[in-house]
Structures are given as C-alpha cells and as structure tokens.
C-alpha cells in the first residue's frame, strides 16, 4: 500500500487541462526530496515527462508544471492542450529514482463528445455573454422565432419573438436580428451561470417546414491561478474582467466553500485582517485592477477570487477570476517586528529588510492611508525627497550590503500612528508592513538638547549638547545635519565618555558639537542620537536658527546660551519650541501614491535633487572639541 | 443548500455486488466534489471514494482496499452520484454516507472537507 494518494481516474476531453494533485506523508525529507510525474511503459519502464528538478520532456514542453507545496504536502501536475495521445497510465511519485514511492494515475483523454450535425459549441465563463447564432431559410421569414433548451426529452422556451422570456432568463436573453439579415437571428444570453449550460435549439417556423439548429453550450468556472508565495512576503492579484464591467465596483473576495468574503472593493468595504497591508490600485480605464497584500502570514493561504457588480459584492452570473495562493513558510525574507511602539516627542528606529543581492536598488518607505481602496504615499526615499510635514524628523539610512535599512522618525505625535511598508524598486515581495503605536509620553525623554531655544549669530562660535542617561554609555553617541537626502554626521565631542563606566554620573553624560564660526548654511534641523554599530537607536532633533550679528547686542557666550535656556520655565520652552516649527522648511511634496508611481520615484527626486539639498555634510563647519 | 438524499443499502452475500446512489437537490455548479465515507460498527467513520469535477475534468478517488471492486460515477442531468460495489466482503459492512461540496480543493479523503452530508444507508455484507 502506497504512502502517495491522488486521483486513480481522470477524465478530460481534448483541449482541455488537468491540474492532478498528489499526496505525500509529511516529512522533512519528503518535502525536500524530487518529485516526477512518469509514463508507464509496456516494458515496466516508466518515462520521467517532468520533475521538481528542472526536467522537462519534449512532449510536455510549453504545456505543463509540476509545483511542490511543501505546506501542504502535496505537489500538483498542470498539464494543458490535451489530446487522445495523453490517454495512459502515469506515476506519480517521490524519490530519486522512478520506482520510490508512487500512486499510479489513469489519465484518460477522449474526443470533444458528438453532437448532433449542425450542432454549434459555445464555451463561456461564468459571468459573460454568449451570442447563439440561429439561422434560417427565406420562407420563414415572418415566421416566430424562439430558442429553447433541452431538458431530458422535452425542449422548454427560453425566448421567443413574441417577447416571452423564461423567468430564470429575465433580464438576461434578448432575440434580435442585425441590419438586414433575412437568415439569422441571434439570441444573447448574459451573466451565465453554471446552470445555463446544455443544448438549446434554436427555431424559426412551426411544424415540418420550421428551419432548426443546434447548439451546446459549456460554461466554466475559472481556473484557478497558481501563487506559491513565501511568508511575509507580497502578492499581487492582477485582474482584468473586460471593458463590460469597466464601470462597475471591483473586488476581491476569499472563497470560503460557497459564500466568498471579501477582503476589498471600490466601495470602501475592507477586512480588517488585511488592515495596513492591502492595496487596491485601478490600472485603465478598461475595468483592469490590481490588489496588492504585503505581509503574508499563513492564514492568508486559500482561494481568492476578483470580479465585478454594482453592490461590490459577488454576485451570480457575473465574471470573476480565480487564484489559489500557498504560503510557504519556508521564507527568505527574515522576520522583523511587524508592531513598534514610541512615545510621543521620542522616536522611532525601523528596520527594513531588502534583497541582499539588491543592494543598489532605491529604498522607500510609505505611509499605508485606509482611504476607499487604500493608497502607500511615499514619505522617505534613497533618492526621493522627505514628504512636506516630515522635514527635520524623518530619514533612511542605506546601509549597503547588511541587507537591511533603517528609517528615523522622530519628534513623534499620536497622528504618527498607522501602518508604513518599506520597499524598494528592486524584488517586489521584499515589501513588509509595520504598524507603529504612538503612546503619550509619561516621563521626560532619555536624550534632550541644550539649549533649546537654539539661535546662532554669524561668525560666532555655537556649541549645542545633548544629555544622554547612562544606559546609553557603552552606545556610540553622534550629531548630524538633517538634510533632504538623509541625516549626515558631524564630528562630535563626546564628554561623558571620559569617566569610568562604573562612576557614571547621570547628570554630565553630554555629546556636544561645536559650529565655529556659524554660517548662514548652518541653519536648519540637527539629530542628537545613539547607535550600536549600524543598528540605529533613540534620536532627539532641534532647529539651529541663524542670524545676523546685531549691532550693539551683547555677545553672549554659547555656554552662558545654555545655562539660560536650562533655566527656563517651561512656557518659555514651549514658545521657542513653536518658533522653531515655523522655522521648518516648505519643501514641496512628492506624493507616491501606488506601486506604478513608486517606480518613478527615483526619476522624480533626481530632477529635486538640486533644488531641495541646502547644506549637506561637506559644506559643514563643525568641529570637534 | 444542498440536500443529500442516500438509497441502495440492503443486506447481501459475500461477493454480491450493490449500487449506492446519492441524490443532491439544490444547486450543484460546473465545479465540485461528492465523496462517499463509511463507519462500521465500533469504528471510526473512514474514506471510500470521492469525484470531483471542474468543468469537463472529473477526477475519482479510492481508499485502497475497494480499489478495483469499487467504482464512483455520476449523472450530471441528474444530479447523483453512484457508487458501484461488487465482489463485496463481509468487512465491507458500514453505514456508507454521502458527502457534497461545492469546492474542488482540498484532500478528498477529509471527511471536514465536505460541507453537505446524507443521512446513511446500512450496508452488511454476511459470510
């Protein structure tokens, strides 16, 4: 008794396809291990036709595919463009060789069945329309013409030229001639549904004189498209269900036996479980759609379907296109957090994983929004300039080769929270979703700046410190200029790091960075923070206004600067803090809203580059004390 | 919803032969499954043989011990399937149920994959 399982009888009739779907016992090694699809021979021999190896025959070539999913443990033979010269008896098996483990399968391919002469076959998908051509001789010219359809001996009107209609056909089937035509009628059936399907015969004129044809009609449900996708990876499901339906509300919806629930449609309607990482983006005027779902866990695995109605619900009758998603949780792309909480006026490191072979592609990074069909516009990128709103607190730090980069959002507001993706323009399942939580802050925050109403006069020397506490003692401290291409260091004084770790004392643990002398180019946003080698930590920022040395106003020592501000109510800090934010830069924005646009992005920025990068680390003038 | 509706039980002699036939009312589509399960006394309800169709593709189904003496068809323009026993053993004796579904996917031998079942018919095989 053979451990395989799958069909031992398939039936089909040429043209058409099969999908054959054989089991094995769930091991490791049978996972892993070949899988085939033989011919058995007269001689016992049995002719490998397609392995999981990469081997494919002559015979099969352009026509079949063989798919492991291990999940599921089970692998699947499509074969299409059958003929009778298919009919056999193949293996199904597991294992090296052809005589491991097998499930022997009869594939028996007969001939499209003999109708009756003048019979017409019309093959249709479930939703479309089908035009029935009638014809008939001049003498039944003036005569009633029906069509009706086959039940067992009797023939039942569907439709007939004295504007009867069948009731399970209202709305459906309309009788017509074209322009001039004296021979042919037509009757269009549309939205068929599966019970549609058998013979009609059409007819013009009564009794022995009456003109007859014949027509059979199929109506197919889809075939299911295959998606072997990896774990925490991304799908698209491209739809296109024809210019007929171009104005109606699309969807996507989940089969689950025979209702099919839907995840999204043009109508607003989302699941909550795809919250954050689904996408719906129309692509013509045509009715062509696409549904992007980032983040793939398991539970996503199943049978998905798109189509087309007013209500944006499915709906008998109307087309619809089918996918079979597996997830394999054997996955190439690492597990990072998918939830990252932050405080308010703190920040946020996020790590985002890429294709390690595609190190020079552009990084993006996008706010995910839940309006109707969902929409990522990017907010960060490698060459893309940080969104209006963002400026002085958001940047992406590549860091080539690690696979991997990190994007800073500081000064951080509960308007923060949502879902971000981070992608790039290179391998599109490298796309994950982080949902980030802004909390209200109850304590003050680890690293704060002095001074903090922070004006520096031209030609003067500015200092501006930062107070970390001690947990941060062992992590490199830094200072860097925030510009629109990202965050660039600056040499920095690091005075805590003169004592002994053991005798850290809380209250002079200060990195401080010197501007000397103070140029117009100096002003503008600069970070404060901690790192560990490339993994990026806590950062703080503040805005370095600059302005002219007025006559007669008292030079003040930077040092006495801060002891003032250190003295400061905190009203006095909240206004200067107000100051500061009308001091922001208004760089235009530039919106990203879906994955086409997402590939322009790098084009776009490049135009903005010049304009949009004032002051970068080489025209800086910090210096190290 | 699909009704299930099973007949041709009876009492037969060991290497007699009997038709199972399982009547669906109710919409059955271009797609699905019927699967027929057993459950002999004291035992746990098994896997016989199954059908599916997707369009004009049917695939059958058997448990290995009926392979070669069971067979499993199905009339579309009546909506019922069959199940063709012959050379029956007395362990043959079981309650057989039919089983539905409007979905093609899945292990046919799962019986948590079928979503409509028949009431049973009792078939006992003497020596």
């Known amino acids: 008794q053979s451990p395989i399982f799958g069909p031992q009888d398939v039936s089909s009739i040429e043209g058409n396809s099969v999908s054959i779907t054989c089991y094995y016992p769930d091991t490791s090694v049978n996972r892993h291990t070949r899988k085939y699809w033989c011919r058995q021979g007269a001689n016992g021999y049995c002719a490998t036709l397609i392995s999981s190896n990469g081997y494919l025959s002559k015979e099969y070539s352009g026509r079949a595919s063989l798919i492991n999913f291990p999940e599921n443990s089970t692998f699947v033979i499509n074969i299409a463009h059958l003929t009778q010269e298919d009919t056999g008896s193949y293996k199904c098996g597991l294992g090296t060789t052809n005589r491991g483990l097998f499930f022997d399968v009869s594939l028996e391919v007969s001939q499209v069945p003999e109708f009756p002469n003048d019979t017409h076959v019309y093959t249709k998908d479930i939703g479309r329309t089908v035009t029935i051509e009638c014809r008939f001789k001049e003498g039944n010219a003036h005569s009633k013409k029906s069509l009706c359809k086959k039940r067992g001996e009797a023939c039942e009107v569907v439709i007939d030229s004295t504007e009867y209609v069948d009731p399970s056909y209202k709305d459906r089937a309309i009788l017509f001639m074209k322009g001039t035509s004296r021979d042919i009628f037509y009757v269009n059936i549309s939205h068929l549904i599966p019970s549609d399907a058998g013979l009609y015969v059409c007819q013009a004129g009564e009794g022995p004189s009456a003109d007859k044809n014949n027509a059979d009609l199929q109506v197919l449900e889809p075939e299911p498209e295959l998606l072997y996708k990896d774990l925490r990876s991304s799908v698209t499901f491209e739809c296109d269900l024809g210019r007929e339906v171009a104005n109606d509300a699309k969807y996507l919806c989940r089969k689950n036996k025979e209702t099919c629930d839907v995840i999204i449609n043009t109508l607003g309607k989302r699941d909550p479980a795809f919250e954050g990482r689904i996408l719906l983006t129309p692509r013509d005027d045509n009715g062509r759609f696409s549904v992007l779902i980032t983040g793939l866990r398991k539970e996503d695995a199943g049978h998905y379907q798109c189509g087309a109605h007013s209500s944006g619900l499915p709906q008998e009758g109307w087309p619809v296109q089918a996918w079979q998603l597996f997830v394999n949780e054997e996955s190439t792309i690492p597990n990072s957090r998918s939830v990252v909480k932050g405080v308010t006026g703190g920040s946020v490191a996020i790590v985002c994983p890429y294709n390690p072979k595609e190190s020079s592609s552009l990084k993006y990074w996008c706010h995910w929004e839940a309006d109707e069909n969902g929409r990522c516009p990017v907010l960060v990128g490698t060459q893309a300039l940080v969104q209006e709103g963002y400026e002085g607190r958001l940047a992406l730090f590549d860091q080539p080769g690690s696979g991997a980069y990190t994007v800073i959002l500081n000064q951080l507001t509960t308007q923060d929270s949502g879902f971000y993706w981070c992608l790039t323009d290179g391998d599109s399942r490298w796309r994950t979703t982080i949902e980030l939580q802004v909390a209200e802050a109850t304590k003050k925050p680890d690293l704060e700046v002095t001074p903090q109403n922070a004006t520096a006069v031209i030609g003067e020397t500015f200092t501006i410190s930062c107070h970390y506490p001690c947990k941060f003692y062992s992590q490199e401290k830094y200072w860097c200029k925030w510009s629109n291409d990202g965050c660039h260091i600056l040499p920095s004084h690091d005075e805590g790091a003169r004592q002994s770790s053991v005798s850290c004392d809380q209250s002079s643990q200060i990195v401080s960075m010197t501007l000397n002398p103070v140029k117009k180019e100096d002003e503008g946003w600069y970070w404060c923070g901690v790192k560990e080698g490339q993994v990026y930590g806590e950062t703080t920022a503040i805005y370095v206004a600059v302005e002219e040395r007025t006559r007669g106003s008292p030079h003040i020592n930077p040092t006495d600067a801060n002891a003032r501000a250190k003295d400061a109510p905190e009203e006095e800090a909240m206004e200067s803090s107000v100051r500061e934010d009308e001091n922001k830069a208004n760089l235009d924005p530039r919106l990203f809203a879906d994955e086409r646009e997402i590939q322009n992005a790098g084009d776009q920025a490049q135009e903005n580059r010049a304009s949009g990068n004032a002051g970068s680390a080489g025209g800086q003038s910090g210096s190290s004390k | 919803e699909v009704q299930l509706v099973e007949s041709g039980g009876g009492l037969v002699q060991a290497g007699d032969s009997l038709r199972l036939s399982c009547a669906a009312s109710g919409r059955t589509g271009s797609s699905g499954a019927m699967g027929w399960f057993r459950q002999g006394p004291g035992k746990e309800r098994e896997f016989v043989a199954a059908?599916?169709?997707?369009?004009?593709?049917?695939?059958?189904y058997y448990e290995d011990s009926v392979k070669g003496r069971f067979t499993i068809s199905r009339d579309n323009a009546k909506n019922t399937a069959y199940l063709q026993m012959n050379s029956l053993k007395p362990e043959d004796t079981a309650v057989y149920y039919c089983?539905?579904?409007?979905?093609?996917?899945?292990?046919?031998?799962?019986?948590?994959?079928?979503?409509?079942w028949g009431q049973g018919t009792l078939v006992t095989v003497s020596s």
């Open positions: 059908l599916m169709w997707r369009n004009t593709v049917t695939y059958k």
């Open positions: 089983a539905a579904d409007p979905d093609t996917y899945g292990d046919p031998r799962n019986s948590g994959a079928y979503d409509y």
